[in-house]
Amino acid sequence: KAMHVAQPAVVLASSRGIASFVCEYASPGKATEVRVTVLRQADSQVTEVCAATYMMGNELTFLDDSICTGTSSGNQVNLTIQGLRAMDTGLYICKVELMYPPPYYLGIGNGTQIYVIDPEPCPDSD
């Protein structure tokens, strides 16, 4: 079967600037090493938000200073992006690469539109 990546079309970030979504992939082979990358597309510019490589059955580990965290279960990755502000609203694309064993496979989702609304500042209390 062909490599296919599915992710939700729209997600609304919480008032604390946290957005979570599931990135699920159909695998053409039995990969033991998988790399997951979150890309952000805004104004036709694509940038890398975060990336993690994990061994199947092991935990997903992002760099310490990453704004992303995640867990994996089989061919499903639960991704959480933190510290989002209104200006970070955009299309977040899940890229999945099956790294090992060969052959390598590439899969790219259609993207999740994440809407971020900055919370209203609390009124001053007397």
């Epitope: 062909a2 790294m99 052959p103």
Partner: antibody
Framework: GVVQPGRSLRLSCAAS????????MHWVRQAPGKGLEWVAV????????YYADSVKGRFTISRDNSKNTLYLQMNSLRAEDTAVYYC?????????????WGQGTTVTVSS | QSPSSLSASVGDRVTITCRAS??????LIWYQQKPGKAPNFLIS???ILQSGVPSRFRGSGSGTNFTLTINSLHPEDFATYYC?????????FGPGTKVDIK
């Protein structure tokens, strides 16, 4: 360079003008009067390497990020390895795309 | 990839097709190569034009059938065009299509 069949040769590709350690790198070859043939790719950190079936077990791709240099070690060379060899940068977002190419180096395998 | 070669005139609309042996989604790349030069990256992911590539170039397709269209051929467009799949290793190229002057 010219090399005899069965011998070895190492190609080098010195990169400049970009952060070499952030990009995957490829080797692609082109036999005289023929089309392009992908040879090998190495990930930005050297963690993953993949090869064409025609060179698997004979060629080794490697890199030295401290020297901004890509290598192709070619062993057990055959007449059919005669070609122009290009090094090419993998695109930042999609490594399999080759967005910047070297000018190429000619390898002739002949007795 | 077809045709293997074609003759055209400046101003012509040219269409080159690339067929994959299995579905590669939209993971297809197009390159242009002129004699004695290294290839030039034109289009990624079937239809995304690279920076500096004129808008007369257009890529389309998905699955197994892909097309590169040059809407109005310019003198500098006479070259050989290659497709390449980026879906899985080995990252194979098509045999190329040479576009020459009629």
């Amino acid at each position: 360079g010219v090399v005899q069949p069965g011998r070895s040769l190492r190609l080098s590709c010195a990169a400049s003008g970009f952060t070499f350690s952030s990009y995957g790198m490829h080797w692609v070859r082109q036999a005289p009067g023929k089309g392009l043939e992908w040879v090998a790719v190495i990930w930005y950190d050297g963690s993953n390497k993949y090869y064409a079936d025609s060179v698997k077990g004979r060629f080794t791709i490697s890199r030295d990020n401290s020297k901004n240099t890509l290598y192709l070690q070619m062993n057990s060379l055959r007449a059919e390895d005669t070609a122009v060899y290009y090094c090419a940068r993998g695109a930042r977002i999609i490594t399999p795309c080759m967005d910047v190419w070297g000018q190429g180096t000619t390898v002739t395998v002949s007795s | 990839q077809s045709p293997s070669s074609l003759s055209a005139s400046v101003g012509d609309r040219v269409t080159i097709t690339c067929r994959a042996s299995q579905s590669i989604n939209t993971y297809l790349i197009w390159y242009q190569q002129k004699p004695g030069k290294a290839p030039n990256f034109l289009i990624s992911a079937t239809s995304i034009l690279q920076s500096g590539v004129p808008s007369r170039f257009r890529g389309s397709g998905s699955g197994t059938n892909f097309t590169l269209t040059i809407n109005s051929l310019h003198p500098e467009d006479f070259a050989t065009y290659y497709c390449q799949q980026s879906y899985s290793t080995p990252f194979t190229f098509g045999p190329g299509t040479k576009v020459d002057i009629k």
